[in-house]
Interface confidence: low
């Protein structure tokens, strides 16, 4: 019996087609993705093949002005229109709190939304009961398939799930649910979830009874053969894990941003054993037409956005590199731009001993969610900035000891190379890392722009000195694992909305051209 | 682990430079000392060496009209500006009574003020509590250093400390404090104090755990080798005392009146034992330029700034250091400002392959003729800029081979240190010089901001590549000895008036705050 699994993950509000790097579409003839194009391909496969499931592995929320304005209603509406069969909750589904998940999505979705390792407690338990499930048994042709969901246990550090949701270890939580499915004589089980490729592989290895793992969170691109676009495969598609009980378990993920549709064909024997698996992500490029009815609906929903966001704020004459491939690994000029805007927004020159009350900015690279292409006449709009800074946060002022900052910079690279969001972009700071040293001891130079000086220049960080720093509220609140900031900050003052800070700066500067100038170095 | 101790003692209100005999300066070209000159040397050493402490062994108070008028406020202000790490109380610090010490100095100093053998009693005890300390543990690089203070026990006979301060025997009082530091695992301890050379030597002999003694009060001049001025050495620098427990303890003092900066290098082993010590007082003569920002501050305190009366173009919140002492020797923020304006005035984004046609600026430091003080409400007028750029030149565009630029940068430092005008300020260039190499081979790194790129970043200069550069017409015409530019330029286009370029930029930016950010470095 053959099953076709179509899957998406980490779509991040890319309802419209995008450019190849998943930023705003500029040249339509070269654009990719978007729900209208996705629907065309899904329908084509549904017509051609008998047993098809369309699954999403989380993080539909957050990423463009669509989410800023519609706050998840757009996710429910268009996923319903595409007739998704199931979705797993991602960490970003909690970005607007539990209420921001329940009202627009959980109550409106016509498909099951799953997570086995999220347990509600307190007053939330009854309120959310039945709105998401640990698993769902779906009829597919003459057979049934069990879908069991999971969500990154790091979600409390990554989003805003509140205090009434407990995120358990994925493997610990999944096993009893899979066992339950087995007792229900469900012998074909897909784990669908959002915890990253490493955890996906562990689930494949450790959870007895899981036949296929469909993942997300790490934006992992897998491909067999010559990849069709710029993404470099992290492995073959599907990635085969040998489970502890000796089975070959296919693990898949489909990069991110709706650029690809994951396409996996699984052959089961009569006992539900996987006897073959093959496929590849399908690049949703312009050779696939956008479905006219979905496109018309998109255009209708777009009207509200256009009024909101299409005014030019200023111009860039350089590519504003906000890609995760840059900003999570090294100094990126988008990080420099944002930090420069953050400092500029905080000029308070009051005291002759100090050229300014604050000179430093830190910014988690993972908070930079999109690049901005300069080849659209250089125009920068609110919409562009909302894709870069989609989280609706604020840029806040904190006071920290030097020792806390040192810990923060150690944390920045404690697991360097895994494309994790804690890698810090900076302003008013020169940092040198030595990645050959052990985690926790990798910062070999940390110079900071003086404030108690008339000519700003860089001096070594002093462990016992108290410094003011501008940073995203997300970091002030300990996000991306920066617990030391939350625990050790001496003062915290809320600031202005992140997009507004950057848009004001760009409007003021008129033309911008930030460079990669050596703020962050590796020795 | 190596520690550099910079030290002064018995400065006695010599904030301005003095004649060779420490009286009022008459012929400026032969004058010495003063806080502006001291700051230049201190900063030079801080930049060059990793672990530096700047210490004062007392008697800053008393000696010139500065103390008569400002009553110690000048000491706090300028010692803060110089970023002293610690000071010991001298007898003269009590000349205006305890109140005359507490209000202007103890409450305003941003560095610890120390004395272990002064004990407060009665109502004074709570009032003065925490304002001076017996010792302070200072972080220096990755290590900590304990500084324990002492003051001449003769102070009640020499000054006006009142009845609520008890001056104990130095050795008796120091030992328990040193013992306390040892229990805190502080294994590198400096005794810093003001009791005279004989007591300094006794402390070195008798106080177990003291590694170095930095003294004052007796105006002792120590020197190894041929002394550089009129003072006759009382012994070698450092003076080595063998302690009762068999250790070699270096003892130093730096004459008086700010004429010398004591310079002592100590090498400690892992257990905090002194394994070597060497150095000499540095004569602060006119070969060392006075730091312009400190000098400007001195002049302000001395005569009050004139009000400017012309139109405001924009504001600066930093000191725009256009002094020859800076701009002819190192990166100066006035040079950075002007170069940034020159690039901004030449934004011509025409080709998708190039973010801009030009990214580089060079500017002879000798062409910057004045600083601009930010302490006039930050106001910048055309008149100010005309003082900076008085020659009515233009900022031009040239095309040069990389090899020509390399020659230009070699010329920039071919006779470095003579305050000659050819020292280049830059924009879009990162240069590293090694002045220990022979002239013509001093440029060890020359990275330039790419133009044929979508994200500007720094790449090594290529000898055979052709680059566009913005520079003053003076340089394009071979001025300041830049014959190679005149001889080898491939194209030269006249540009806009120099003052106008800068004034337009300042008007556009509204508020400026250029920094010294590492464009020019010395290895």
């Amino acid at each position: 019996w053959e099953l076709t699994i179509l899957h998406t993950n980490d779509v991040h509000s890319r309802l419209e087609q995008t450019s190849e790097d998943s930023s705003k579409c500029v040249n339509a003839s070269r654009c990719m993705g978007g729900v209208a194009r996705l629907f065309t391909k899904v329908q084509q496969i549904r017509r051609a093949e008998p047993n098809v499931l369309l699954l999403d592995a989380g993080d539909q929320y957050q990423g463009t002005i669509w989410f800023t304005v519609y706050k998840g209603a757009e996710v429910a509406h268009f996923m319903n229109a595409l007739r998704y069969d199931a979705m797993a909750l991602g960490n970003h589904e909690f970005d607007n709190g539990v209420e921001g998940l329940i009202e627009p999505l959980l109550k409106e979705a016509k498909f099951p939304i799953l997570s086995a390792n999220i347990k509600a407690k307190g007053p939330l338990a009854s309120q959310i009961s039945g709105l998401y499930l640990p698993y769902k048994v779906l009829p597919v042709g003459d057979e049934v398939v069990g879908i069991v969901g999971y969500t990154s246990k790091e979600t409390p550090f990554l989003s805003n799930p509140g205090t009434n949701l407990v995120f358990e270890d994925e493997i610990t939580a999944l096993q009893p649910e899979v066992d339950k499915l087995k007792t229900l004589n469900v012998n074909k089980i897909i784990a669908l979830g959002h915890s990253g490729f490493e955890t996906d592989k562990l689930i494949a290895q450790k959870v007895r009874g899981v036949d296929v793992v469909v993942g997300g969170h790490s934006n992992t691109f897998l491909y067999t053969g010559n990849p069709p676009s710029k993404e470099v495969p992290a492995g073959k598609y599907p990635f085969i894990v040998t489970s502890d009980d000796g089975r070959k378990v296919p693990v898949v993920q489909a990069y991110a941003f709706g650029k690809y549709l994951g396409y996996l064909k699984i052959e089961f024997d009569e006992r539900g054993n996987v006897i073959s698996s093959h496929g590849n992500p399908i690049l949703l490029n312009s050779s696939i037409p956008e479905d006219p009815s979905i496109k018309a609906d998109i255009n209708k929903w777009r009207i509200k956005l256009d009024n909101y966001s299409t005014q030019e704020l200023g111009k860039t004459i350089v590519y504003l590199d906000g890609s995760s491939q840059s900003c999570r690994f090294r100094e990126c000029n988008m990080g420099n731009l944002i930090c420069d805007a953050m400092i500029n927004n905080n000029l308070r020159h009051a005291d002759e001993m100090f050229w300014n009350h604050v000179s430093m900015c830190i910014l988690n690279g993972g908070g930079i969610r999109s690049p901005i292409d300069e080849r659209n006449n250089g125009t920068i709009t609110w919409e562009n900035l909302a894709a870069v800074l989609p989280f609706g946060g604020t840029f806040d002022l904190v006071q920290l000891k030097g020792s806390t900052l040192k810990k923060a910079f150690e944390h920045s690279v404690h697991r360097y190379g895994q494309s994790t969001g804690e890698f810090l972009q900076v302003g008013g700071i020169h940092v040198v890392y030595d990645l050959s040293r052990k985690p926790g001891d990798r910062v070999v130079k940390l110079d900071v722009l003086c404030t108690k000086c008339r000519v700003p220049s860089y001096d070594p960080l002093k462990m016992d000195e108290i410094y003011k720093v501008i940073l995203p509220n997300f970091l002030a609140n300990g996000g991306d694992g920066f617990q030391m900031i939350k625990d050790e900050l001496l003062r915290h003052d809320s600031g202005d909305q992140d997009i507004n800070v950057v848009s004001t700066y760009i409007s003021k500067m008129k033309v911008i051209y930030p460079a990669v100038e050596g703020r962050i170095k590796f020795s | 682990w190596e520690l550099t101790i910079l030290h002064t003692n018995d400065v006695h209100s010599r904030l301005e430079q003095t004649s060779e005999d420490s009286s009022k300066c008459v012929n400026a070209s032969r004058c010495m000392g003063g806080v502006a000159r001291l700051f230049t040397k201190v900063q030079q050493i801080r930049r060059a060496e990793p672990n530096v402490l700047l210490l004062d062994a007392g008697d800053q108070y008393q000696g010139t009209i500065w103390f008569t008028v400002y009553k110690g406020a000048e000491v706090a202000h300028f010692m803060n500006a110089l970023r002293y790490d610690a000071m010991a109380l001298g007898n003269h610090e009590f000349d205006n009574g305890v109140e005359g010490l507490i209000e202007p100095l103890l409450k305003e100093a941003k560095f610890p003020i120390l004395s272990a053998n002064i004990k407060a009693k009665g109502p004074l005890a709570s009032q003065i509590s925490g304002l001076y300390l017996p010792y302070k543990v200072l972080p220096v690089g990755d290590e900590v250093v304990g500084i324990v203070g002492y003051t001449s026990k003769e102070t009640p006979f020499l000054s006006n400390p009142g009845t609520n301060l008890v001056f104990e025997d130095e050795i008796t009082a120091l030992q328990p404090e040193v013992d306390k530091l040892k229990t805190l695992n502080v294994n590198k301890i400096i005794a810093l104090g003001h009791s005279g050379f004989e007591t300094d030597k006794l402390i070195a002999q008798k106080v177990r755990g003291v590694d170095v003694v930095v003294g004052g009060h007796s105006n002792t001049f120590l020197y190894t080798g041929n002394p550089p001025s009129k003072e006759v050495p009382a012994g070698k620098y450092p003076f080595i005392v063998t302690s009762d427990d068999g250790r070699k303890v270096p003892v130093v003092q730096a004459y008086a009146f700010g004429k010398y900066l004591g310079y002592l290098k100590i090498e400690f082993d892992e257990r905090g034992n002194v394994i070597s010590s060497h150095g000499n007082p540095i004569l602060l003569n006119s070969s060392i330029p006075e730091d312009p920002s400190i000098k400007a501050d001195i002049n302000k305190w001395r005569i009050k700034l004139d009000n400017y009366s012309t139109q405001e173009l924009g504001k600066t919140i930093v000191y725009l250091d256009g002094s020859s002492q800076s701009c002819r020797f190192r990166e100066c923020n006035m040079g950075n400002l002007i170069c940034d304006a020159m690039i901004n005035n030449n934004l011509r984004h025409a080709d998708e392959m190039f973010w801009n046609h030009v990214s580089m600026c060079i500017l002879n430091g000798g062409g910057i003729r004045s600083p601009i003080d930010e302490r006039n409400n930050g106001t910048i007028t055309w008149e100010n800029l005309a003082a900076v750029l008085p020659f009515g030149g233009t900022f031009d565009l040239v095309q040069l081979k990389g090899s020509t630029l390399k020659k230009a940068f070699e010329h920039s430092v071919h006779r470095y240190g003579q305050s000659t005008g050819e020292f280049l300020q830059v924009g879009g260039i990162h240069v590293v010089y090694d002045l220990s190499r022979k002239p013509g081979d001093r440029v060890v790194k020359l990275d330039v901001l790419c133009t044929k790129c979508r994200v500007p970043s720094y790449d090594p200069l290529k000898m055979d590549e052709i680059y566009k550069v913005i520079l003053p017409n003076f340089l394009a015409n071979g001025g300041d000895g830049f014959q190679m530019i005149k001889d080898e330029l491939l194209r030269h286009d006249s540009g806009d008036q120099d003052i106008n370029v800068v004034s337009t930029y300042i008007s556009k930016m509204k508020v400026i705050y250029p920094a010294v950010e590492g464009r020019i470095k010395f290895s």
């Epitope: 895994q418 050959s436 052990k438 | -």
Partner: antibody
């Protein structure tokens, strides 16, 4: 999958120089340092140094400073090691190696090795 | 440079034996030690890093331990395919390897 494909064996005369190549595939070349390791016949391993393909920055074992020069060509995802003034002491198998994660060490991925023989 | 003194140079083993190799660092290297296996004509293979963490896919008969200056590598039950040279390596200060231990059949 991740592969490091090195150039073939070299027979060179004393005093000459040689350039060994290492073609990387299956991962983001610029994101990981490329290390080089020497193994003389029947001997242990000696770390030569590494180069960061992203910016061309390199770090050398002092023993090999002046002997080895490391370069990269990002466009072809290839790393190179140039060895100069060769003597019989330089006869060895030379490996390129990539770290597990972006560490300098913990070499999880190795080239197949290039035998360099220095002989008159 | 940190010197890694590896002992013994040779080990004669039979299938099923338990084997222990030691490496002593000339100064503390924390836990920044890796172990490699090299078979004739092949490139080395990473087995253990951070002194005790098994690299992906390495059988659990291979274990490592130690901290500071003394490190141990153990094969709990030697199999025929384990005959090879084993190297330790430190990455705490620059990067150096041990001289190697050759496992040979008795």
């Amino acid at each position: 999958q991740i592969q490091l494909q090195q150039s073939g064996p070299e027979l060179v005369k004393p005093g000459a120089s040689v350039k060994v190549s290492c073609k990387a595939s299956g991962y983001a070349f610029a994101s990981y340092n490329m290390n080089w390791v020497k193994q003389s016949h029947g001997k242990s391993l000696d770390w030569i140094g590494y180069i960061d393909p992203y910016n061309g920055g390199s770090s050398y074992n002092l023993t090999f400073k002046g002997k080895a020069t490391l370069t990269v060509d990002k466009s072809s995802t290839t790393a190179y090691m140039h060895l100069n003034s060769l003597t019989s002491e330089d006869s060895a198998v030379y490996y390129c190696a990539r770290g597990y994660g972006n560490y300098k060490a913990w070499f999880a991925y190795w080239g197949q090795g290039t035998l360099v023989t220095v002989s008159a | 440079d940190v010197v890694m003194t590896q002992t013994p140079k040779f080990l004669l083993v039979s299938a099923g034996d338990r084997v222990t190799i030691t490496c002593k660092a000339s100064q503390s290297v924390s836990n920044d030690v890796a172990w490699y296996q090299q078979k004739p004509g092949q490139s080395p293979k990473l087995l253990i890093y951070y002194a005790s963490t098994r690299y992906t896919g390495v059988p659990d008969r291979f274990t490592g331990s130690g901290y500071g200056t003394d490190f141990t590598f153990t094969i709990s039950t030697v199999q025929a395919e384990d005959l090879a040279v084993y190297f330790c390596q430190q990455d705490y200060s620059s990067l150096t390897f041990g001289a190697g231990t050759k496992l040979e059949l008795k």
